[in-house]
Amino acid sequence: IWSAVFLNSLFNQEVQIPLTESYCGPCPKNWICYKNNCYQFFDESKNWYESQASCMSQNASLLKVYSKEDQDLLKLVKSYHWMGLVHIPTNGSWQWEDGSILSPNLLTIIEMQKGDCALYASSFKGYIENCSTPNTYICMQRTV
């Protein structure tokens, strides 16, 4: 069973979200379940470290982008939100919170500010930002 859910605060347009847990889940209450991932958008502005701590306190992590297919709903996200991607200044690599390397061809990383953290924006773009700057954030939890 699918229901058209319009989440005005997060998405640019109507997004199809399955309602029954047999299709997806389980997820924490009021989180979005989509293709075996749970997502939640947090409207309060925090710096990257505080955002990370907030997600961790809910047994989740900041958004990790790993698949354009499985995470195609992210194309529709509007505005800018902290994700779990960080720049390692010593060697210039881009890594997720869990230490895994950003896969090529997933994100276009755009220099908005000098910094070592990244904001997610629609169409698989990441914007470099100072980690201390307050922003809204997206938490993610894998269901499998």
């Epitope: 390692i88 690599s93 390397i101 950003l102 090529p104 276009t108 220099e111 000098k114």
Partner: antibody
């Protein structure tokens, strides 16, 4: 058509300086990271330096650190490499190369300029 | 620094042959690998990026595979214009590093 044209190479004595330039056209220069890669005569490719689109991130090979300076002028669509304290082992063809269209995460180089030869000899 | 080791350093082959070149990274680089072709007196040309993605305009006889530390460039049916030197390069971190090159020569 995307084009990169290097200039500024030549013969210089050890300890001397040179400034290489790379003129870019056919793409939005300010959106791409840019790189210098060199190739000594008869040898393989050696990455020299990279600069991100807004010059926020700059990296150098250990072999040139402290002697070479990469810079860019987005208004002029130009990339530069200031080379000081040149050594015989810096003798090479120097190529200017654009980063892949992935912004700051660009990992490879395309396209490349035709190269400019730098010869360091007394 | 990540070391890139290419093998063989040279290979003699005939037109129509299948040629395989391998590249090994000293540590895991996910799929951050590119392959270039260089002909004498010319600038290198990007063939494959992200380990297996074919660059626009490159013939489909070129293919790349691998992930982590071990990668392969394959030319399915060697053509006269393919005789050149091939380089791999890791793009995950700085310093960017290249393999030593593989020269594909006419047998």
């Amino acid at each position: 058509e995307v084009q990169l044209v290097e200039s500024g190479g030549g013969l210089v004595k050890p300890g001397g300086s040179l400034r290489l330039s790379c003129a870019a056209s056919g793409f939005t220069f300010s959106s791409y990271s840019m790189n210098w890669v060199r190739q000594a005569p008869g040898k393989g490719l050696e990455w020299v330096s990279s600069i991100s689109s807004s010059s926020s991130y700059i990296y150098y090979a250990d072999s040139v650190k402290g002697r070479f300076t990469i810079s860019r002028d987005n208004a002029k669509n130009s990339l530069y490499l200031q080379m000081n304290s040149l050594r015989a082992e810096d003798t090479a063809v120097y190529y200017c190369a654009r980063g892949a269209p992935m912004g700051a995460a660009a990992g490879w180089f395309d396209p490349w300029g035709q190269g400019t030869l730098v010869t360091v000899s007394s | 620094d990540i070391q890139m080791t290419q093998s063989p350093s040279s290979v003699s082959a005939s037109v129509g042959d299948r040629v395989t070149i391998t590249c090994r990274a000293s540590q895991g680089i996910s799929s951050w690998l590119a392959w270039y072709q260089q002909k004498p007196g010319k600038a290198p040309k990007l063939l494959i990026y992200a380990a297996s993605s074919l660059q626009s305009g490159v013939p489909s006889r070129f293919s790349g595979s691998g992930s982590g530390t071990d990668f392969t460039l394959t030319i399915s049916s060697l053509q006269p214009e393919d005789f050149a030197t091939y380089y791999c390069q890791q793009g995950v971190s700085f310093p960017r590093t290249f393999g030593g090159g593989t020269k594909v020569e006419i047998k």
